[in-house]
């Protein structure tokens, strides 16, 4: 992604010395998502903005690192800085879901969703129902609305598939599950083909 790292760095470099110190202290107590560790206190307190950015990205990956930075900035009352990060997050299509599962699970090829891309684009008609099932846990609000804005089912599915390269296995499984519920016969047909 790259842009998220730059945005985090920009935000941290905008903090005064005291604010950066406060940011680090809050980072030591902020609630973390399950499966993520805390940056050790000793190392954290020594870091400048560049080191801290690198550590945030290496510990939490870009997507969640960006969100965590926003949370801490909001908690500090620095709304404007947090909003700038929110804009970056939306523009880069940083689906938080992509960071919610360790990265090694994202590389598996041959998933139903990848195998049947063309058929799904051509044959899924109840796209809005599929989107509703993916909202929030897979698609950001911006992505959801971007797909809905397309006029035909095929264009909607094409737009949806434009986000798939950044998805992990859980996200793809969510799409498959939604398709099974909304288009069960289509999924059965494709699984047998």
């Amino acid at each position: 992604m790259g842009r998220a790292r730059d945005a985090i760095l920009d935000a941290l470099e905008n903090l005064s010395g005291d604010e950066l110190k406060k940011f680090k202290m809050k980072l030591l107590t902020v609630q973390l998502r399950e499966g993520y560790g805390r940056i050790p206190r000793g190392a954290l307190l020594q870091m400048d903005a560049i080191d801290l950015t690198d550590k945030l990205v290496s510990y939490y990956l870009e997507s969640y690192g960006l969100e965590l930075t926003m949370t801490v900035l909001r908690d500090m009352g620095l709304q404007e800085l947090a909003e700038q990060l929110q804009t970056t997050k939306e523009e880069s299509g940083a689906v938080a879901a992509a960071a919610s599962v360790p990265a090694q699970s994202t590389a598996r090829t041959g998933h139903f969703v990848d195998q049947h891309r063309q058929a799904l684009i051509a044959r899924v008609t109840e796209v809005d129902g599929v989107l509703d099932a993916l909202h929030g846990s897979v698609l950001t609000e911006g992505q959801y609305q971007a797909v809905r804005a397309e006029t035909t089912s095929q264009d909607k599915m094409r737009k949806l598939f434009s986000f798939v390269p950044s998805w992990n296995l859980t996200c793809k499984d969510s799409l498959l599950q939604a398709l099974k519920e909304i288009h069960p016969y289509l999924v059965m047909d494709l699984e047998q083909s």
Epitope: R33, Y64, E67, V95, A96, A97, A99, S100, D128, G129, D132, A133, H135, G136, S137, T140, E141, Q145, T170
Partner: antibody
Framework: EVQLQQSGAELVRPGSSVKMSCKTS????????ISWVIQRPEQGLEWIGY????????EYNEKFKGKATLTSDTSSNTAYMQLSNLASEDSAIYFC??????????WGQGTTLTVSS | DIQMTQTTSSLSASLGDRVTISCSAS??????LNWFQQKPNGTVRLLIY???SLHSGVPSRFSGSGSGTDYSLTISNLEPEDIATYYC?????????FGGGTKLEIK
């Protein structure tokens, strides 16, 4: 049975913060989102924001950005909302609601917040 | 923001009556409309989602209809336990917004 059990009534001083909880049961917590809704005295309902549990993805009503912070704890199947810099106009009932396919299907019983000096 | 308007803030009807509560949106909401019931004790429950789908456990005397900007909730055979305030809510666009509510009383 789907249940959302909210924490008890709060009486707090202006300028302080409060963190209310919404303990869920009867469904897979990580498969859903939780939304929060405010109802001021003798008034209607207003959406505050939502959090999707699986990934922590949040969206807020512009009116509540900086006021509300939504979090969750998957180990206890509990969603939280922290309200900061409280003023008398924040006195209200706050509901947590489960989101299913973008609509609100099950509501908590509400937490009454009173901000008074 | 999409404004949701329930023009009737309160209405009175007799037991057994057919009651219709209206709701209009300031722009089209593609049927992304819910109806909620709030009892006098404060409890809220979903009645209808996506304009006309009946939520599980809700009596079939409740029904919803509409499209575009105009929607309605109908109670076909009013019962004592239907005394409540009814809210419509759009979930087409953020911020999700509610109507002002219609308080239903028994004559």
């Amino acid at each position: 049975e789907v249940q959302l059990q909210q924490s008890g009534a709060e009486l707090v001083r202006p300028g302080s913060s409060v963190k209310m909880s919404c303990k869920t049961s009867g469904f897979t917590f990580t498969s859903y989102g939780i939304s929060w809704v405010i109802q001021r005295p003798e008034q209607g309902l207003e959406w505050i924001g939502y959090i999707y549990i699986r990934n922590g993805y949040t969206e807020y009503n512009e009116k509540f950005k900086g006021k509300a912070t939504l979090t969750s704890d998957t180990s206890s199947n509990t969603a939280y909302m922290q309200l900061s810099n409280l003023a008398s106009e924040d006195s209200a009932i706050y509901f947590c609601v489960r989101i299913h396919r973008r609509f609100f299907d099950y509501w908590g019983q509400g937490t009454t917040l009173t901000v008074s000096s | 923001d999409i404004q949701m308007t329930q023009t009737t803030s309160s209405l009175s009807a007799s037991l057994g009556d057919r009651v219709t509560i209206s709701c209009s949106a300031s722009q089209g909401i593609s049927n992304y409309l819910n109806w909620f019931q709030q009892k006098p004790n404060g409890t809220v429950r979903l009645l209808i989602y996506y304009t006309s789908s009946l939520h599980s456990g809700v009596p079939s005397r409740f029904s919803g209809s509409g499209s575009g900007t105009d929607y309605s909730l109908t109670i076909s055979n009013l019962e004592p336990e239907d005394i409540a305030t009814y809210y419509c809510q759009q979930y087409d666009r953020l911020p999700w917004t509610f109507g002002g509510g219609t308080k239903l009383e028994i004559k």
